[in-house]
Every structure is written in structure tokens, then in C-alpha cells.
């Protein structure tokens, strides 16, 4: 016999300083008059009164005079609350209590957000830089909410996760300034990008800095490799570039070239005594013999596997000696997600359904994002699991549990963080009762 009070299941997202409507409705019976209505809005956790309507009259705002009802719509069952000039402190759960003869209540969540500014970048030290110097790059973004995630990447889009320190500072209004510090050892040159992501707005603010240091004079052989990781798709061939500058009169008889795994020192390939000594690495490596005399010591790695990922060091010795390490980042695209629904027939609003999004044979592990038809992120009741096969590729399965509304679209986005490849799948559930997949 209770009164059914309806509110949106998903949080209401409001930007700081704007107005928000917390929707709440009930179904008035025939002959209903406002004199019968008791309506109370209060903060769910603290029970603080926000706004009320009783004895046929709007009792006004008890919440900083920033709330209002919709008086012309109350008689039709619209008990929504307007909250003006939203502040961070307003965030939380609001309960709508409706009493006529029977009584009902429901809680609606307010999620406050504020976009972050375009990041500013600073460099320390910022002059007389040479390869091998350690520099500190600071990325700062201001006046956002809620806390930001900060991602660093190099010029090829490869994530930089080591030696990153991120801190937040809250101001009196509850907005955040985020400061992220990246410490890097400079290569020949490099671009460093900082991305500040607002997790509610899914807003990304980017900035980057490109550093071209001066050459360092040295007696050693200068060995050059790409500063950024080489990204290779599983099953394809990859070239790990390495070069040196041969002096006039240089002959291959003088050259000792060794490629090895940086961490384990396992021999990969070598050229000594004027001859290619061949592959010591599963017979999948080769040099470029016609280019060696011009200083091209690059290594070709065939049929790349996940297990190949890592750092390879190129050692060059003529009279002097030099070495440099190049990183191989392996990747594999994820398949278009397949979507399944359980239960998948006779569905009605209010039913709890499990939507599974599966994407296969990718690398590295995927991030999975869910959102509704309006593009609002769905983060609650999501369980994501990864399964690795014998080749080291991943299958990702993400399960979303939702209570159905009258209709709805649920989208799953599987992101490969290295390839920045997004694979999408979605399911639209409409009608009442409904069946999935829809019958022809």
C-alpha cells in the first residue's frame, strides 16, 4: 500500500555554479489535492532538512535559500527540487519523502563536477640541458572537481609511469589543483605530454613540452637509439633501430656489435670478427648487413610475440665503446566487444539485468568503460576480469549489473592503452515487456 516514489537511478551531474534539478515524482490518485500532500527533501546521511511542502503550502528552503520546488507541477506528481548555484559541498544523496495517505521515499544522488584548466608545464632545470641529464617536468591544472587522474606519455603516446608523483591541493570551495611531477633522464630529444582527466566529466585536458638538449662531447662511440619505445603488433616484424657514426677509413673488421636483453644480459644477436654470428634468440633476429658499414646497427625481430616485450641493448665497439637501450612495446588490438544480456527475455522496468561485454586477444590489458545512452559513465556494479592465454594475449570480460528503466542504451568501450584503440559495443533495451535480442 506504499506510495511509489520515482527518482533517477543514475547520479545527477551538475557543474559548480550551475543549477541542478533533482527529479522526484509520484502518481497522484484521482481527486488528489495539494492540501493532502506532505513533501520533504532532506540530506540522506545527516537527515538535515533541505525543503518541504506541507498543509498546502511551500514551506520554503531550509538549505541556504538555494532550493525551490516546481509549484505548478506538484499537483501532477512532480516533486522535483531545483538546487541553484551548485557548490562542491552540495554533493551527496538527497531523499525525497512523499506522504499523501500512504508514504514513500527515494534517494537521488548529486554528483558535482568542475572542469580542469589546460595544464601548465614547467621544466627544471630549463637550460643547458644535455642527453643524460635528469630533468623534472611539472604539470599543473587548476580548479577542477572531483580529483583528477594524471597520465604522462611520450611523443609516441607510450605511457610513462615510473618516477611520477601526483599531489592534490583543495581550496576553500573544495575545488582541486593537481600537480604532477615527472622525473626523466633526457635522450637525444623528446616530447612529454601530460593529460589531466576529470573522471566524472570524462574531460581530458592536455599539454606537452618538447625538449631538444645540446649534444654532449664525448670520446666514446655515440650510439643512438629511439628514445621512445618501438611499438610492434603481435605477429608482425619490428625494427629496433640503432646507429653509430663510423669514422673515415672504418671497416667492418674493426666492428664488434652485440645485441642483448638489457635486464637478463641474454645474447640476442652479434657481429664480430667481420662476420654476422647469427641469431641467439629463437632464430627470429637479423641485422641489415648491407647497411652496417654506414653505421646502421639496427636489429630486425620477426613474428613478434608478447614475451619479446622489454628492453634490448645495442653495444658497439670499434676502438671506443658505446651502448644504448631501446624498448620494445608489444601490442595487439582487441576485437569488437560482444554483448550478452542475462536474463534476456520478458524484461520489465525495475528488473536487474547483467550485461556482459567481452573482447578478445588483445595486449596489453584493456581498460573497460561503461556509459549510458547520454554518455554518462556507469561506474557502480561493474566487475572487469582479464584472462591471459598461452601466448600472453588477454581476453577481457566486463560485467555491468543494472536496474532497467523504461528503456536504455548501455555502451561498453574497451581501450587498448598502448594503441589508444577503442573498441565499442552497445545494447539498447526498449519496450515492456522486452526480449533480447529483439525479435525480427
Amino acid at each position: 500500500g506504499a506510495l511509489e516514489v520515482q527518482v533517477p537511478e543514475d547520479p545527477v551531474v551538475a557543474l559548480v555554479g550551475t543549477d541542478a534539478t533533482l527529479c522526484c515524482s509520484f502518481s497522484p490518485e484521482p481527486g488528489f489535492s495539494l492540501a493532502q500532500l506532505n513533501l520533504i527533501w532532506q540530506l540522506t546521511d545527516t537527515k538535515q532538512l533541505v525543503h518541504s511542502f506541507a498543509e498546502g503550502q511551500d514551506q520554503g528552503s531550509a538549505y541556504a535559500n538555494r532550493t525551490a520546488l516546481f509549484p505548478d507541477l506538484l499537483a501532477q506528481g512532480n516533486a522535483s527540487l531545483r538546487l541553484q548555484r551548485v557548490r562542491v559541498a552540495d554533493e551527496g544523496s538527497f531523499t525525497c519523502f512523499v506522504s499523501i495517505r500512504d508514504f514513500g521515499s527515494a534517494a537521488v544522488s548529486l554528483q558535482v563536477a568542475a572542469p580542469y584548466s589546460k595544464p601548465s608545464m614547467t621544466l627544471e632545470p630549463n637550460k643547458d640541458l644535455r642527453p643524460g641529464d635528469t630533468v623534472t617536468i611539472t604539470c599543473s591544472s587548476y580548479q577542477g572537481y572531483p580529483e583528477a587522474e594524471v597520465f604522462w606519455q611520450d611523443g609516441q603516446g607510450v605511457p610513462l609511469t615510473g618516477n611520477v608523483t601526483t599531489s592534490q591541493m583543495a581550496n576553500e570551495q573544495g575545488l582541486f589543483d593537481v600537480h604532477s611531477i615527472l622525473r626523466v633522464v633526457l635522450g637525444a630529444n623528446g616530447t612529454y605530454s601530460c593529460l589531466v582527466r576529470n573522471p566524472v566529466l570524462q574531460q581530458d585536458a592536455h599539454s606537452s613540452v618538447t625538449i631538444t638538449p645540446q649534444r654532449s662531447p664525448t670520446g666514446a662511440v655515440e650510439v643512438q637509439v629511439p628514445e621512445d619505445p618501438v611499438v610492434a603488433l603481435v605477429g608482425t616484424d619490428a625494427t629496433l633501430r640503432c646507429s653509430f657514426s663510423p669514422e673515415p677509413g672504418f671497416s667492418l673488421a674493426q666492428l664488434n656489435l652485440i645485441w642483448q636483453l638489457t635486464d637478463t644480459k641474454q645474447l640476442v644477436h652479434s657481429f664480430t670478427e667481420g662476420r654476422d654470428q647469427g641469431s641467439a634468440y629463437a632464430n627470429r633476429t637479423a641485422l641489415f648487413p648491407d647497411l652496417l658499414a654506414q653505421g646502421n646497427a639496427s636489429l630486425r625481430l620477426q613474428r613478434v610475440r608478447v614475451a619479446d616485450e622489454g628492453s634490448f641493448t645495442c653495444f658497439v665497439s670499434i676502438r671506443d665503446f658505446g651502448s644504448a637501450a631501446v624498448s620494445l612495446q608489444v601490442a595487439a588490438p582487441y576485437s569488437k566487444p560482444s554483448m550478452t544480456l542475462e536474463p534476456n527475455k520478458d524484461l520489465r522496468p525495475g528488473d536487474t539485468v547483467t550485461i556482459t561485454c567481452s573482447s578478445y586477444r588483445g595486449y596489453p590489458e584493456a581498460e573497460v568503460f561503461w556509459q549510458d545512452g547520454q554518455g554518462v559513465p556507469l561506474t557502480g556494479n561493474v566487475t572487469t576480469s582479464q584472462m591471459a592465454n598461452e601466448q600472453g594475449l588477454f581476453d577481457v570480460h566486463s560485467v555491468l549489473r543494472v536496474v532497467l528503466g523504461a528503456n536504455g542504451t548501455y555502451s561498453c568501450l574497451v581501450r587498448n592503452p598502448v594503441l589508444q584503440q577503442d573498441a565499442h559495443g552497445s545494447v539498447t533495451i526498449t519496450g515492456q515487456p522486452m526480449t533480447f535480442p529483439p525479435e525480427a
Epitope: 540522506t44 546521511d45 562542491v88 559541498a89 554533493e91 551527496g92 544523496s93 544522488s109 554528483q111 572537481y145 572531483p146 580529483e147 587522474e149 599531489s167 592534490q168 591541493m169 583543495a170 581550496n171 576553500e172 573544495g174 575545488l175 582541486f176 573522471p199 561506474t379 557502480g380 561493474v382
Partner: antibody, heavy 121, light 108 residues
Framework: DVQLVESGGGVVRPGESLRLSCAAS????????MNWVRQAPGEGLEWVSR?????????YYADSVKGRFTISRDNSKNTLYLQMNSLRAEDTAVYYC?????????????WGLGTLVTVSS | EIVLTQSPGTLSLSPGERATLSCRAS??????LAWYQQKPGQAPRLLIY???TRATDIPDRFSGSGSGTEFTLTISSLQSEDFAVYYC??????????FGGGTKVEIK
Amino acid sequence: DVQLVESGGGVVRPGESLRLSCAASGFTFSNYAMNWVRQAPGEGLEWVSRINYKGYNITYYADSVKGRFTISRDNSKNTLYLQMNSLRAEDTAVYYCAKSGSNSNNFFDYWGLGTLVTVSS
Amino acid sequence: EIVLTQSPGTLSLSPGERATLSCRASQTVGSKLAWYQQKPGQAPRLLIYGASTRATDIPDRFSGSGSGTEFTLTISSLQSEDFAVYYCQQYINWPPLSFGGGTKVEIK
């Protein structure tokens, strides 16, 4: 009434692992950032880790535990966790679960009673 | 990292006396400072947040003041249950969310 109840403490050897849990009730758990704070015997309070609200899983750690401890939360179970790996003698302390006043005001308005972790060979 | 320094380390007073505890921050924390009370064998309890706002159910003999880098917790008339250790904590900037070293208020 807000309640935070920690569990999972005990005696372990250096290098071993332990997982602490904190069961929360009396408030909308997912709407609040949560923290672990520890107190070594006879010492002051030391903040250990924080996880922000909802499902955003933005986490922070004290330098002393970074890379060894992992904070997580299960909003469906109203539970906060602290996975502690590679434990050291200096990790011996009472570990408190503490609720942030809000996501932007990280004072600790409610605390659990604590669970004792002893790392000893 | 913001360092909080509490003084004195120990305060010896009699019931009924006024206690004044100090907390100094190494850089400004605005008004984002909290005070806690901890009795032996118990969890800490929030007394003050926002430098001067009393938490729920905290008696009005406890008051906080200050902003920026200098803060004070005052207990106007000590009761027997007020003898405990008091900590300040900043929450303007993290990580870390730092605490002061504590001030012990003991019976003279």
C-alpha cells in the same frame, strides 16, 4: 550510527603479506573517500593510504608503503581493503580505517577501533 | 610535503585550568586543519575541522582558531575526561595527509 570495523590483523614474519578489511555501515559508503591510518606502539598517527569516492579508484600512499601496499574498495559490500605485501618490522602498528569528511575535505570524522599488525621474526 | 609541529610536547595542568595547544605548519594550509583527541587504547576522535568548526557532539569548551600556518586548540576548563593526547592534521594537500607529533595533556 556510523560504524567502521577493521579485521585481518595478526602476527606475520618479515616479507609476508596480510590483507586488512574494514566493514562500513551507517552512511552511504560509496559517496566518501576512505583512508587507512596507522599508529606504531607508543608513537603518533601516520596516514598510510587514501582512496577517493565512487568507483574512480584514485589512490594515494605514504612514501613508506608505496609499492608494497594497495588500497581498494568494494562499494557493493561497503568494505575497504588494504593489501600489505613485503611487510617489514617497521610496519608493526595498529591500523585504523577512517572515513573522510567529504571527498574534498580529508579530515577523518569517523574511525574504527583498529586492528593490530605485528611483523616479527 | 607539509610538516606540522605541535607544541608543547607535554602540558601538565590541573582540572579546571585552561589548556592552549599550538600547531604550526611548514607552509600555509588555509583553514584546512583538524584536531583530534586520543585516549589510551582508543581510536582518535575528531574535535575540530576547518580550523574552528566543532565536530558533532563535541562540548563547547573545545575551540579552535588560526589560519595559514599558526593554529591553536583551546580547552577552556579542563575536565578529567580531557586528559589525553591531541593531534593536528592538515588536509589542504596530499599525499601525504600529515599529522603533527601530538601534545600530551596530563594531570599535574
